[in-house]
């Protein structure tokens, strides 16, 4: 387990000609915020594919109003880091997408308007625990300067955060075959990578990824005492001199949730349930109103009636929590029949049916699907005596073995070419057209029919603003 950290240094006009218009004006003040999406490996998946390593949204930056006649300067940035926690091993190679969003603060009906100003993407190698890596990326006429690093959360160490360190049991040396844990020379490398969060005092493992408890302790991470009143005689390295068992440290000890948030232990870490007006991993973000866009995952924000209830998020199906930040485990209702495997895709539930069954909930018993496999989460559907696969999002073909083409819908207008780039679809416009999807003609005088072109978009510019 660990955290990927992103520090934005500047966002402003890049070098060279064609400085972009300021995204804000006296009539329409605005502020910036950033979103980062991480995917493991050298992903060639489109930008629409899930951020499998995680995603994070920054706070809003200071309000900015353009000075009339002045060129766009570096724009004021939000404070702090963007942090993307990862639960498992750090993959070493990853793809990133960083989006710069503009929040217009004019008199829009229904609250602030958001628009994507720029998107940059790349693929990088990065070892956890290393120094900050600096980067510069350009999107049209904009330039984004940032640094990033991945760091392990104790007790994990190593370039992939897969080695665990524990305090030495003896003052002088580590156990047989175990090395000191650089840079923590007073700690020793653990012999096995147990399940993340497994109590080092009360848990152990004989297979990687498991967490088995010493006598007197229970719970998925061995942090819950079987009984705090009885005096047991625990075996193992944490044997108390009194022989009495005391509760081991748990992730909620000391309540990491600020501002009255309540902490609940999860199999891998902890989760804060925040009171209204607060959100964030530890309920640390406060003073929030609908103008701050606190509702995630498409939640609708409604202003509260009093200061203690500054806003209420009405969550879309599949999400819950005061900020719609928690995905509802709709599979817990066991909607898939006949032994089907339930997949919660976020936008929909999908049942992966056993051979011989089909239908949205595996309710149809079909002989013609028996023994026919649909790959990549596709389901077999009866089709007049022949089997047909209904493929999961992102896949196609007779057996769902082909990755679906983000260009299949022909999104690039006027003969523009669509390319399936790893950072998302890319349009290369035919001569005479421009815009995100080649939708605007370029007039002979060089002007375009673009009503209000996104900053940095020039004739012949590729798709960068999804």
């Amino acid at each position: 387990a660990g955290v990927f950290e992103l520090q934005i240094h500047s966002f402003g006009p890049g070098p060279g000609p064609g400085a972009p218009r300021s995204p804000c004006s006296a009539r329409l003040p605005c502020r910036l915020f950033f979103r980062v999406c991480l995917k493991p490996g050298l992903s060639e998946e489109a930008a629409e594919s899930p951020c499998a390593l995680g995603a994070a949204l920054s706070a809003r930056g200071p309000v900015y109003t353009e000075q009339p006649g002045a060129p766009a300067p570096d724009l004021p940035l939000p404070d702090g880091l963007l942090q993307v926690p990862f639960r498992d091993a750090w993959p070493g190679t990853f793809s990133f997408i960083i989006e710069t969003w503009r929040e217009e603060l004019g008199d829009q009906i229904g609250g602030p308007a958001w628009s994507l100003l720029a998107r940059v993407a790349g693929r990088r190698r990065l070892a956890a625990g290393g120094p900050w890596a600096r980067d510069i990326q350009r999107a049209g006429a904009w330039e984004l300067r940032f640094s990033y690093r991945a760091r392990c959360e104790p007790p994990a160490v190593g370039t992939a955060c897969t080695r665990l360190c524990r305090p030495r049991s003896a003052p002088s040396r580590c156990g047989p075959g175990l090395r000191p844990c650089a840079p923590l020379e007073d700690e020793c490398e653990a012999p096995l990578v147990c399940r993340a969060g497994c109590s080092p005092e009360h848990g152990f493992c004989e297979q990687p990824g498991e967490c088995r408890c010493l006598e007197g302790w229970t719970g998925p991470l061995c942090t819950v005492p079987v009984s705090t009143s009885s005096c047991l005689s625990p075996r193992g390295p944490s044997s108390a001199t009194t022989g009495c068992l005391v509760p081991g440290p748990g992730p909620c000890d000391g309540n990491p949730c600020a501002n009255g948030g309540s902490c609940s232990e999860t199999p891998r870490s902890f989760e804060c349930t925040c009171p209204r007006g607060f959100y964030g991993l530890r309920c640390e973000v406060s003073g929030v109103t609908c103008a701050d866009g606190p509702c995630f995952n498409g939640g609708l924000c409604v202003g509260g009636a009093d200061p203690d209830s500054a806003y209420i998020c009405h969550c879309p199906p599949g999400f819950q929590g005061s900020n719609c930040e928690k995905r509802v485990d709709r599979c817990s209702l066991q909607p898939c029949r006949n032994g089907g495997l339930c997949l919660d895709l976020g936008h929909a539930l999908r049942c992966r049916c056993r051979a011989g069954f089909a239908g949205p909930r595996c309710e149809h018993d079909l002989d013609d699907c028996a023994g026919r496999a649909c790959a990549n989460g596709g389901t077999c559907v009866e089709g007049g005596g022949a089997h047909r696969c209904s493929c999961a999002l992102g896949f196609g073909g007779r057996d769902c073995r082909e990755r679906a083409d983000p260009c299949a819908a022909r999104p690039c207008a006027h003969g523009g070419r669509c390319y399936a780039h790893f950072s998302g679809l890319v349009c290369a416009c035919a001569p005479g057209y421009m815009g995100a999807r080649c939708e605007f003609p370029v007039h002979p005088d060089g002007a375009s029919a673009l009503p209000a072109a996104p900053p940095g978009l020039r004739p012949g510019d590729p798709q960068r603003y999804l």
Partner: antibody, heavy 119, light 110 residues
Framework: QVTLRESGPALVKPTQTLTLTCTFS?????????MGWVRQAPGQGLEWMGT????????DYASWAKGRVTISVDKSKNQFSLKLSSVTAADTAVYYC???????????WGQGTLVTVSS | DIQLTQSPSFLSASVGDRVTITCQST????????LSWYQQKPGQPPKLLIY???NLEIGVPSRFSGSGSGTDFTLTINSLEAEDAATYYC??????????FGGGTKVEIK
């Protein structure tokens, strides 16, 4: 493993038509790419010959290659091919196939195949 | 026809030197930044170093960097290493789905 591999004759006689094949694996033409041919004469630089766009199988050629070069795709065999007509000694080169997936760069290349034009 | 001119065509430098190669196009590349740089060693296909003028390809050492837009571009090797001896090519993509390569710059280690 995503790979490209060129194949074809090592020796061609002048005036004949050279046919080369690029076999790809690890990806499918159901996605949209430019599949291109680039050649390099001994001791010389790289020269783009042409590309075929898998979205609609339209082709684009270098100005010198128009009328001499034909690029086509056989989707069922996971191959695309190059035909170069009326070859001369000046067409002696290493021929590479390459893939473009956006932003104008060839991110994947074959190892290349040397073709000598000689009688 | 579009021409990409690289200069110099040959350079000799010592390990640790900062090396700069320029690439000038007779037309603006598509989107102002659809220009890439490749390294080629004898008997091998070109290897992508930089795409979109300044994006470092995965696995390429950070001593390589690219800059520029429109018609003028630069590849910089910050601290030359012995393994960097190779020929370097720029390549542009242009409106009308046209590709072009520069003539190449051979880098030799003194």
């Amino acid at each position: 493993q995503v790979t490209l591999r060129e194949s074809g004759p090592a020796l061609v006689k002048p005036t004949q038509t050279l046919t080369l094949t690029c076999t790809f694996s690890g990806f499918s033409l159901s996605s949209s790419y430019d599949m291109g041919w680039v050649r390099q004469a001994p001791g010389q630089g790289l020269e783009w010959m042409g590309t075929i766009y898998t979205g609609d199988y339209s082709t684009d050629y270098a100005s010198w290659a128009k009328g001499r070069v034909t690029i086509s795709v056989d989707k069922s065999k996971n191959q695309f091919s190059l035909k170069l007509s009326s070859v001369t000694a000046a067409d002696t080169a290493v021929y590479y196939c390459a893939r473009h997936t956006g932003y104008g760069y060839f991110g994947l290349w074959g190892q290349g195949t040397l073709v000598t034009v000689s009688s | 026809d579009i021409q990409l001119t690289q200069s110099p065509s040959f350079l000799s430098a010592s390990v640790g030197d900062r090396v700069t190669i320029t690439c000038q196009s007779t037309e603006s590349v598509y989107g102002s930044d659809w220009l890439s740089w490749y390294q080629q060693k004898p008997g091998q296909p070109p290897k992508l170093l930089i795409y979109q003028a300044s994006n470092l390809e995965i696995g390429v050492p950070s001593r390589f960097s690219g800059s520029g837009s429109g018609t003028d571009f630069t590849l910089t090797i910050n601290s030359l290493e012995a393994e960097d001896a190779a020929t370097y090519y720029c390549q542009g993509y242009y409106s009308g789905y046209i590709y072009a390569f520069g003539g190449g710059t051979k880098v030799e280690i003194k």
